[in-house]
Interface confidence: low
Amino acid sequence: RSTEQGESCSGLLGADAKLAGNTHQHIFNDLSGSVSLAWVGDGTGVILALTTFQVPIFMITIGQSKLYRSEDYGKSFEDVTNLINNTFIRSDFGIAIGPENSGKVILTADVSGSHGSRIFVSSDFGKSFTHQELPFVPLMQITYNPENSNVLLALSNKNELWLSEDFGTNWKKLYDAVCLAKWGSDNTIFFTTYANGSCKADLGALELWRTSDLGKSFKTIGVKIYSFGLGGRFLFASVMADKDTTRRIHVSTDQGDTWSMAQLPSVGQEQFYSILAANDDMVFMHVDEPGDTGFGTIFTSDDRGIVYSKSLDRHLYTTTGGETDFTNVTSLRGVYITSVLSEDNSIQTMITFDQGGRWTHLRKPENSECDATAKNKNECSLHIHASYSISQKLNVPMAPLSEPNAVGIVIAHGSVGDAISVMVPDVYISDDGGYSWTKMLEGPHHYAILDSGGLLVAVEQNAHQGVNQIKFSTDEGQCWGVYNFTKDPIFFTGLASEPGARSMNVSLWGYRSSLFHQYWISFTIDFRDLITRNCEEKDYTIWLAHSTDPEDYEDGCILGYKEQFLRLRKSSVCQNGRDYVVTKQPSICLCSLEDFLCDFGYYRPENDSKCVEQPELKGHDLEFCLYGREEHLTTNGYRKIPGDKCQGGVNPVREVKDLKKKCTSNFLSPEKQNSKSNGSAGGSGGLNDIFEAQKIEWHE
């Protein structure tokens, strides 16, 4: 495989002339500072660019914002700062884009020292803005109701919860002393409140409330709450125990009307829970280990969110920075990548292809040698750099990248050895969802997936010199063309392409320095003149996902079904196009014991696929006996893995056992935990539980 133009990449030669005719430069005549970009709508070509420049002077910060708008995917920008009355916009709140294709935009102004604030709103994709005065100062970005973009929710710096039903024109205060608020489905809002001093002081003694009618009525659905979160169809709350300062997870699937205790270990003050990923079927939950270890355990849930199976030990998740490498590979169903912290304190990458059922190391790329971390130079694995490496300021410009419509493609920085290395990484690609890997580019790069995977682009990371080259590939990274997009190099800051990876345009952002000032500059390259032909049926080939043994009748079966995809041939140079839809053909597999997890009170002995009754219950199983609901204590020992669609085959039905008799203990059975229980709060301080898929963390 070549990383430069060569004989094998002859199809990419002569691209310069075609690309030069569709390369567009825009100079932003303002002080550099920072820039935030937002695409408004899908396929509209509208981009808003907000540049901010701040200078601290004595006790205050003086700032300047400029707003630019593009209607052609960034090829040209118009200065529309006048639409926001030259107001300084809070860059920490970013540009709040409305859901779906609503065309709505909110910009929050920085009105220092006042008791209120101001927002600028647009309903026409940023063509025009009107300003609205707020009767409060927002604490975080205003959030849209996912189903009705006219309805907005805001939390103020005085912990008040505010709602607008007319896109910010009028606001009503819903509640005081609010710590955290989230939209549920329909018009439901969940929020926690404190009674005494503050969110921090009352941590573990918070109340969880719900309104299902936009604040006309309220219901307490939980007390003694430490934190809460939503994941898929599950509502989670961490609830303080009566007897000590530990807390444990309770789960609801009916918006908080009824709660069940999750069969997970309880945690102490210095530990935390975190939802790593969730969908309507199941949840990945991280439970922090006691002590400042930097790791914990991943558990995967059943379809009720109640019974959990241990999925991965020593999962890296630092308590200090809140960093984990857990990554959902969106280009192939069931695939997740993360890091573990081994006994010798080195970091290793693990991958699962079956939604956490089994984890393995990444296969060594055939075109790579094992590095100095490897004890055996012939046997080693690929290790991927993700959030943690970036937080440690390693030379890793980007996290792993995958897109749902670029089937099977995963791009990531990594090193090949026994563990992640602090040496300068290279870029690796997988075209089969992580089963096999190839070194794609030498050294660190910024990269993007365009045209649903039909086009990849990359820019070499060069902190000390300017950049004037972009690399591009039409064959999933096997061959790379190089295009010099400018004579005068720029200090490159990042690649930007429209979310969804359907565009043929990519923008390179950076700045130039003159003797007296720096200014932002963007180059937008449209590859449509290079790849002119639309793809036809002959350009696609059938690919069976998760295929590891073509001889096996059950080859490709993951979670009870296999999928065949139509994928673009590597040799085809054509446009998938904006309207490209992933074509897949699912087929149901026969059930085997692998399609079932062991229910509460059962376990799988090593190297056995049968679920065996536990001789005695101990640890958090016994706690589940004490606090769990009675209907969850009857079982036949097996439950179908969430999302598993297998039919026929093995049907592990056996007599239903009542486990209640196993739950006898000399503990006094406490009252059932429910949303109305009373009692003094245990503990305060400690770490927040991070109940956000995508790791969007809430900090007090």
Epitope: P290, G291, D292, T293, T320, L341, I347, A372, A419, I420
Partner: antibody
Framework: EVQLLESGGGLVQPGGSLRLSCAAS????????MNWVRQAPGKGLEWVSA????????YYADSVKGRFTISRDNSKNTLYLQMSSLRAEDTAVYYC??????????????WGQGTTVTVSS | EIVLTQSPGTLSLSPGERATLSCRAS???????LAWYQQKPGQAPRLLIY???SRATGIPDRFSGSGSGTDFTLTISRLEPEDFAVYYC??????????FGQGTKLEIK
């Protein structure tokens, strides 16, 4: 400016005790593992003890295990080394150092000026 | 226990010359976990290189580190008067948590 300042050294008899302190400034103390490293007169460097950012995990060299205790007070940005049952071979300059990151090792990037401990009768 | 042996014990060179200091481990050490320090008389050590080859903040580019497995090298491409000092290699990650080499004294010829 990132700084570490040791104190508490001095002359002590064999079998005696001493408590060293290290005041940190210029960085978020609780985010970093901290170490004590010592250097006997005319000799090389020897690692003594380490403690994680929260204080939840502690580590010791075999030569001091059971006699020395490392601790920290993150509210005061201070690291401590409680030394007991001191021996003549514990005589050294004791340095407080800052470590870096879980999983990666970026060296001990900040060192104090050292405090001298002399164990003699 | 991993033992680090540095050689030579003393190296006599003149300013402007190239210095090559060696550190050998008794068993394989991950290059991610090897560091070099400089110590001048009466001063605390200073981190030069971590991860076998990454320069610490503020360290001039005449200092470079290389090596893997059991053999590591610190090179000073062109000696300056202020470079004459004692140099220590250090490994991390096994028991004991850290071990230092015995040091190489770099002196003016």
């Amino acid at each position: 400016e990132v700084q570490l300042l040791e104190s508490g050294g001095g002359l002590v008899q064999p079998g005696g005790s001493l408590r060293l302190s290290c005041a940190a400034s210029g960085f978020t103390f609780s985010s970093y593992a901290m170490n004590w490293v010592r250097q006997a007169p005319g000799k090389g460097l020897e690692w003594v003890s380490a403690i994680s950012g929260s204080g939840g995990s502690t580590y010791y060299a075999d030569s001091v295990k059971g006699r020395f205790t490392i601790s920290r007070d993150n509210s005061k940005n201070t690291l401590y080394l409680q030394m007991s049952s001191l021996r003549a071979e514990d005589t050294a300059v004791y340095y407080c150092t800052r470590g870096r990151g879980i999983g990666y090792y970026n060296g001990m990037d900040v060192w104090g000026q050292g405090t001298t401990v002399t164990v003699s009768s | 226990e991993i033992v680090l042996t540095q050689s030579p014990g003393t190296l006599s060179l003149s300013p402007g010359e190239r210095a090559t200091l060696s550190c050998r481990a008794s068993q394989s050490v991950s290059s991610s976990y090897l560091a070099w320090y400089q110590q001048k008389p009466g001063q605390a050590p200073r981190l030069l290189i971590y991860g076998a080859s990454s320069r610490a903040t503020g360290i001039p580019d005449r200092f470079s580190g290389s090596g893997s497995g059991t053999d590591f090298t610190l090179t000073i491409s062109r000696l300056e008067p202020e470079d004459f000092a004692v140099y220590y290699c250090q490994q991390y990650g096994s028991s004991p948590m850290y071990t230092f080499g015995q040091g190489t004294k770099l002196e003016i010829k």
